[in-house]
């Protein structure tokens, strides 16, 4: 596979040829880290240490902003309990997400004490408001994490809030929450390895899993330590975790805890020379690319390796048939001499636990309907014996030979003249952007990876933790500790002044219109268009 | 005050039918599990079945699977257990239970089954 | 299935003396396990619930132990209207089953 990219271009080669806006950020605030995309108002909401941003998704430079420290008496208290004054007793905006129309929900560390409240934003874009509701804040216990260096996942739906998160002070107390809403607040069993071990959460996300919203499905990503016996000495697993929607605790065990709670392990290897597959175990981000059927997304997640001698990367997509096969599938139980993890052989109890209740099905109108024998089941049973294998059963991108790693994904699907294609927007620990395109072989999950671009985005090297796109601006936002930065989706002019470097670019977005590589669009005429993202040959289509 | 009344026993003969009924009354009666179960001439307590709140699905012992069906009519407050194919061995007092969900929290007086060759 | 067993099968006291009886289940059953009295011509009562949560209306007297495998219904101090037959019942797993019963008669 090419390695090289098509075009590299430094930071100043980005600013020089206008492909790059950077707001590089205010002095009192940093860790521009929680993004909020709302392609309605054409606004990029920041969640940051302190400060809350509200950008133009047009020109970055144009924002507004909101002061949320936390109060003297309450950093003091901070700085006695031993935490660094500047980098953990500030309020780090940790959950950014729309709350209804006019609102949004924010919540922060808050100098180790967490904190929500709402933000108002308006009825239409050209109310122009952005300011905290300063007369409502909430307790942020089980929303936001204590530690900033703590990762979090949330997904605000209906009125409540998903959050993986740490839920103490000592950042050990790691759960799966559901707050706000009118219901008792919901999380994962306390205390429990086999639920959770360590875990870092990467992202949650609703999937419908019927045109049955009684069947819908939040998922959470996250990796976390491998349990004893799952793997010799320390390891790192991926993991896909689920938990039904309308999933309210148990009648008598698991009360206010989740009963639908069930996780798998995500594989994303490549076969090493010695017969042994090396993995990517690190999942950093996810992105779910919704086509057609949102019951069906594709998963691309973003790994890294574990070890610190071999370092590499690597990008694997998952279908989701074969993570429910999975759930579908046995789940890991520990039994024989040596306490071994295998798969359960025994009586499953009916409904099946991770099952949805619904009236559609056996008439479970709730899980509080369960009887006990699935309740304790699903306590003791939380995770799946079958790992989800990735499409291809390969990686689809993977880096190994480079000083960076990946960091996070977004992706975009293009319409080209021979098809479609999805463009992988990859960011690294050092500060650069990777355009990937993935091209189908002999079939569509087949693919052949090709790098267009590699962009520096900000001046001091520094790794994104943050990227949104908009298909609407056709524009790229990406968040670091330094700043944020902004760049166009496709750079056409820079592949060159000829027809047969256009074409051998390969980029789905760019197509040769006669006189120059600019963008293509499918609308436009074919005969006076110029591309070949499959086999890049321009010998075929350029007459020139 | 919670009550539970059996109706519907008898002799019957060997390979024949029966339906039990369970009127209950002084409880919301479609908030709870309901069960059956008998009791063999001076022998221990077996459970036969229990059904769920919404009458959506049932739960069998192997010994009655395929020959009794519990089901309910929330509307009336009763419980049902229709029995085919009745064996000697399914000669008992049959009670009708509130619960099986966890415990067993309130039982009927029993009404007599005789199976008879 | 989970197999209960009682013992002793029969247990004679007298009142005032304190009973234990015990029931064992073939494989752990958490605290899923239940304890019922019945006395001749009568249907079953609930005494304990989960092997140790007392229902209101049982005297005090009664008293469950145990998690896992092994419980215990403990009767501090005997009453003439306690001599009756005891039936320990788990709701871990369908199907639910029964022990055999522990009959206490007056010594």
């Known amino acids: 596979k090419n390695n090289v990219p098509r075009l590299k271009l430094s930071y100043k080669e980005m600013l020089e040829s206008n492909n790059v806006i950077t707001f590089n950020g205010l002095a009192n605030s940093s860790s521009y880290h929680t993004f909020l995309l709302d392609e309605e108002r054409s606004r990029l909401y920041v969640g940051a240490k302190d400060h809350i941003f509200s950008f133009d998704l047009v020109n970055i430079k144009d924002f507004q902003k909101i002061v949320w420290p936390v109060s003297y008496t309450r950093r003091d208290e901070c700085k006695w309990a031993g935490k660094d004054i500047l980098k953990e007793c500030a309020n780090f905006i940790k959950v950014l997400k729309a709350y209804n129309q006019t609102h949004l929900y924010a919540c922060g560390t808050g100098a180790f004490h967490p904190i929500c409240t709402y933000i108002e934003i308006g009825h239409h874009p050209e109310d122009n408001i952005f300011k905290l509701e300063n007369s409502h804040f909430e307790n942020g216990r089980g929303k936001s994490p204590y530690d900033p260096k703590l990762l979090t996942a949330s997904l605000l739906i209906d009125g409540e809030l998903y959050s993986g998160t740490a839920a103490d002070f000592m950042g050990r107390d790691f759960a799966i929450f559901r707050t706000l809403g009118h219901h008792h607040p919901i999380r994962t069993e306390q205390h429990d390895s086999r639920w959770l071990n360590d875990p870092k959460f990467i992202s949650a996300h609703l999937i419908s899993e019927s045109d049955n919203p009684e069947d819908d499905k939040v998922y959470f990503f996250f990796r976390e330590n491998a349990i004893d016996g799952e793997h010799s000495g320390k390891a790192t697993h991926a993991r896909i975790g689920q938990i039904c929607k309308n999933d309210f605790g148990g009648h008598r065990s698991l009360v206010n805890k989740w009963t639908t709670f069930l996780k798998a392990r995500l594989i994303c290897s490549v076969p090493g020379p010695n017969g042994i597959d090396t993995h990517f175990d690190e999942l950093q981000d996810v992105f779910l690319m919704n086509f057609k059927d949102p019951k069906n997304p594709v998963v691309y997640g973003v790994f890294t390796t574990s070890s610190n001698i071999f370092k590499g990367s690597a990008v694997c997509m998952y279908s989701m048939s074969d993570v429910r096969r999975v759930f579908l599938g046995p789940y890991a139980h520990r039994d024989g001499p040596n306490y071994q993890w295998v798969p359960y052989q025994g009586r499953v109890p009916y409904p099946r636990p991770g099952t949805c209740p619904s009236k559609t099905f056996g008439g479970f109108d709730s899980t509080k309907d369960l009887p006990d024998d699935v309740i304790t089941f699903a306590r003791s049973h939380p995770a799946m014996y079958n790992p989800v294998f990735p499409m291809n059963n390969r990686p689809i991108v993977i880096k190994t030979d480079v000083n960076y790693q990946f960091t996070q994904i977004v992706v975009d699907r293009v319409d080209a003249e021979d098809g479609q294609y999805d463009v992988m927007f990859i960011g690294t620990d050092v500060g650069t952007v990777l355009k990937v395109v993935s091209i189908p072989k002999e079939t569509w999950y087949d693919l052949e990876e090709v790098l267009l671009e590699e962009m520096t985005v900000f001046r001091e090297p520094t790794a994104i933790s943050a990227m949104e796109l908009s298909t609407k601006q056709q524009q790229l936002y990406i968040g670091s500790t330094a700043g944020v930065a902004q760049l166009p989706l496709h750079r056409c002019d820079i592949y060159g002044k000829a027809c047969a470097e256009c074409c051998l670019a390969r980029d789905p977005y760019c197509a040769w219109d006669g006189s120059a590589c600019s963008r293509y669009f499918p609308t436009a005429k074919r005969a006076t268009r110029a591309q070949d993202i499959r086999n890049g040959d321009p010998l075929t289509h350029c007459s020139d | 005050e919670v009550q539970l009344v059996e109706s519907g026993g008898g002799l019957v003969q060997l390979g024949g039918s029966l339906r039990l009924s369970c009127a209950a009354s002084?409880?919301?009666?479609?908030?709870?599990?309901m069960s059956w179960v008998r009791q063999a001439p001076g022998k221990g307590l077996e459970w036969v079945s229990t059904i769920i709140k919404s009458g959506g699905y049932a739960y069998y012992p192997d010994s009655v699977k395929d020959r009794f069906t519990i089901s309910r009519d929330n509307s009336k407050n009763t419980l049902y257990l229709q029995m085919n194919s009745l064996r000697a061995e399914d000669t008992a007092v049959y009670y009708c239970v509130k619960g099986g969900q966890g415990a067993m929290d309130y039982w009927g007086q029993g009404t007599t089954v005789t199976v008879s060759s | 299935e989970i197999v209960l067993t009682q013992s002793p099968a029969t247990l004679s006291l007298s009142p005032g003396e304190r009973a234990t009886l015990s029931c064992r289940a073939s494989q752990s059953i958490g605290d899923y396990l239940h304890w019922y009295q019945q006395k001749p011509g009568q249907a079953p009562r609930l005494l304990i619930y989960y092997a140790s949560q007392s229902i209101s209306g049982i005297p005090a007297r009664f008293s469950g132990s145990g998690s896992g495998t092994d419980f215990t219904l403990t009767i501090s101090s005997l009453e003439p209207e306690d001599f009756a037959v005891y039936y320990c019942?788990?709701?871990?797993?369908?199907?639910?089953?029964f022990g055999g019963g522990t009959k206490l008669e007056i010594k």
């Open positions: 002084g409880f919301t009666f479609s908030s709870y599990y």
């Open positions: 019942q788990q709701g871990y797993s369908f199907p639910y089953t």
